[in-house]
C-alpha cells in the first residue's frame, strides 16, 4: 500500500534515501572492523506528509490521528522499507573474518 | 539486536506502545466501515535515545551519526516491530464483508 510519491513540500524535502559518508571512528567501529575504512551509509531521511509513501494501513491511521491530535500522535516516520547487505572484515577471537550484515544499509524508504 | 529497555529520560518517555481511542470519523472510515464504531488504536510513540530498543545495526549506526551530525541525521524513530490483526466489517459493492487487516494495530515497538 505504497501511497503517493509526490512530495508536497518541494523536491527532496520528503522521505527518501540519503547517503552519509562515515568513517569507522564515526560509527564507533574502529576497534572491531578492519574494512571498509569508510562507509557510504544509505539512510532514510525526510518528512512524511499526509499519505506520502505510506507503508501500510497503520501509517494511514497515524496520519489521520496526527492531524486530529498533533500533540499526542506523531506524524509517520521515514524508515527503511528494505535493506542492502554489507560485508565487513572484522576482528574475531581467532583473527579476522568476513561477516555479512543484512540490516545495515537502507535500500528504499517508506513512512510508518 | 534489540538493545536496552531502560529509558534514560524517565518512565514512559521512551518508545513504547500507546493506545489512542479513535472513532470511524476520526479515521476517515465512516463511509466504508460498519464495525467497530470505535477503535483502540495501538501505536508506537516516544523518544529513541542512544541504543534504546535499537531494532538492528542500521538503528545503531543512525544513533552514532545523529550524535555527530544532529542537523543532518535524525535520531532513530519509534515504529512498530510487529502488528496485531484486526477484523473490520466493511461495505462492499454487493453488501458487507468481513476483512482482516494484518498491519493495522501495533503489537510492539522498536527504534529504527
Amino acid at each position: 500500500a505504497r501511497n503517493g510519491d509526490h512530495c508536497p513540500l518541494g523536491p527532496g524535502r520528503c522521505c527518501r534515501l540519503h547517503t552519509v559518508r562515515a568513517s569507522l571512528e564515526d560509527l564507533g567501529w574502529a576497534d572491531w572492523v578492519l574494512s571498509p575504512r569508510e562507509v557510504q551509509v544509505t539512510m532514510c531521511i525526510g518528512a512524511c506528509p499526509s499519505q506520502f509513501r505510506a507503508a501500510n494501513m497503520h501509517a494511514q491511521i497515524k496520519t489521520s490521528l496526527h492531524r486530529l491530535k498533533p500533540d499526542t500522535v506523531p506524524a509517520p516516520c521515514c524508515v527503511p522499507a528494505s535493506y542492502n547487505p554489507m560485508v565487513l572484515i572484522q576482528k574475531t577471537d581467532t583473527g579476522v573474518s568476513l561477516q555479512t550484515y543484512d540490516d545495515l544499509l537502507a535500500k528504499d524508504c517508506h513512512c510508518i | 539486536a534489540r538493545n536496552g529497555d531502560h529509558c534514560p529520560l524517565g518512565p514512559g518517555r521512551c518508545c513504547r506502545l500507546h493506545t489512542v481511542r479513535a472513532s470511524l470519523e476520526d479515521l476517515g472510515w465512516a463511509d466504508w466501515v460498519l464495525s467497530p464504531r470505535e477503535v483502540q488504536v495501538t501505536m508506537c510513540i516516544g523518544a529513541c535515545p542512544s541504543q534504546f530498543r535499537a531494532a538492528n545495526m542500521h538503528a545503531q549506526i543512525k544513533t552514532s551519526l545523529h550524535r555527530l551530525k544532529p542537523d543532518t541525521v535524525p535520531a532513530p524513530c519509534c515504529v512498530p516491530a510487529s502488528y496485531n490483526p484486526m477484523v473490520l466489517i466493511q461495505k462492499t459493492d454487493t453488501g458487507v464483508s468481513l476483512q482482516t487487516y494484518d498491519d493495522l494495530l501495533a503489537k510492539d515497538c522498536h527504534c529504527i
Epitope: 578492519l34 574494512s35 571498509p36 575504512r37 542492502n84 547487505p85 554489507m86 560485508v87 565487513l88 572484515i89 574475531t92 577471537d93 581467532t94 583473527g95 579476522v96 573474518s97 568476513l98 561477516q99 555479512t100 544499509l105 | -
Partner: antibody
Framework: EVQLLESGGGLVQPGGSLRLSCAVS????????MTWVRQAPGKGLEWIGI???????YYASWAKGRFTISKDSSKNTVYLQMNSLRAEDTAVYFC???????????????WGQGTLVTVSS | DIVMTQSPATLSVSPGERATLSCQAS??????LAWFQQKPGQPPRLLIY???TLASGIPARFSGSGSGTEFTLTISSLQSEDFAVYYC????????????FGQGTKVEIK
C-alpha cells in the same frame, strides 16, 4: 599440529561434476574462514571464494553458479562442489585458512598441498 | 569485479640488488592486500598481509607499502632463495566480498 589436506581431485569429463574436500586438523572451522584458490598448469593463482566462520559464502564472479563452497564443522571438512566442468577448470586446487589478506592469530601461512583436477574427454 | 594488475611481468635483478614490484587494484581496497611468494611445485607462501605487515618467519628484507589502489612490495637486497614468482591478492568488500590475485611477477636472476 595444524594441517590442511585436500582430496577428491582426478580426471573428469567436460560437463561433469566433482566435489573436493579439505580436511583440517588442529583448529575448528567454526572459528576460522577458509579460502579456495586454484592454479592452472603453468599459470597464475586464481581466487575462487571463501566460506566464513559463520557459514556465509563469497565467490569470484566467474565461479558463481558453477562452484559452491560448504562445510561440515563436525567433520572438520570444507568442500568445493564444481559443476559443468570445462577444460579450462583443469588446475591444482588449494584450500587455505583465513581470508589471506589479514592474518589470523598463530600460523600466518596455512595452505594445503593441493589436489589436481583434470577436465578432459 | 575487482581486478588486480601487477607490473612488471618479469623482473631481472642481480643478487644483492633491490627489487620493487607493483600491484594496482581496480577498486579502493584500503589495506586488504597480501603478497605471496611461490616456487615451482609448492603452495604459495605468505610474505605480507594488511598491505604492510610482515608475516611471521619472513625476513625483514621484504616490505610492503600502499593503500587504496596502489601497492608495492620491496625486496631490499635479493638473496638467491628470493628468485620466484610473486603474487598480490586483494579483497574488496562492500555489498558483497570478492578477491582476486594479480597475474604474478617473475623475479629472475639477471
Amino acid at each position: 599440529e595444524v594441517q590442511l589436506l585436500e582430496s577428491g581431485g582426478g580426471l573428469v569429463q567436460p560437463g561433469g561434476s566433482l566435489r573436493l574436500s579439505c580436511a583440517v586438523s588442529g583448529f575448528s572451522l567454526s572459528s576460522y574462514d577458509m579460502t579456495w584458490v586454484r592454479q592452472a598448469p603453468g599459470k597464475g593463482l586464481e581466487w575462487i571464494g571463501i566460506i566464513s566462520s559463520s557459514g556465509n559464502t563469497y565467490y569470484a564472479s566467474w565461479a558463481k553458479g558453477r562452484f559452491t563452497i560448504s562445510k561440515d564443522s563436525s567433520k572438520n571438512t570444507v568442500y568445493l562442489q564444481m559443476n559443468s566442468l570445462r577444460a579450462e577448470d583443469t588446475a591444482v586446487y588449494f584450500c587455505a585458512r583465513g581470508i589471506l589478506v589479514y592474518a589470523d592469530y598463530g600460523d600466518h601461512n596455512l595452505w594445503g598441498q593441493g589436489t589436481l583436477v583434470t577436465v578432459s574427454s | 569485479d575487482i581486478v588486480m594488475t601487477q607490473s612488471p611481468a618479469t623482473l631481472s635483478v642481480s643478487p644483492g640488488e633491490r627489487a620493487t614490484l607493483s600491484c594496482q587494484a581496480s577498486e579502493d581496497i584500503y589495506t586488504n592486500l597480501a603478497w605471496f611468494q611461490q616456487k615451482p611445485g609448492q603452495p604459495p607462501r605468505l610474505l605480507i598481509y594488511a598491505a604492510s605487515t610482515l608475516a611471521s618467519g619472513i625476513p625483514a628484507r621484504f616490505s610492503g607499502s600502499g593503500s587504496g589502489t596502489e601497492f608495492t612490495l620491496t625486496i631490499s637486497s635479493l638473496q638467491s632463495e628470493d628468485f620466484a614468482v610473486y603474487y598480490c591478492l586483494g579483497v574488496y568488500t562492500y555489498i558483497s566480498a570478492e578477491g582476486a590475485f594479480g597475474q604474478g611477477t617473475k623475479v629472475e636472476i639477471k
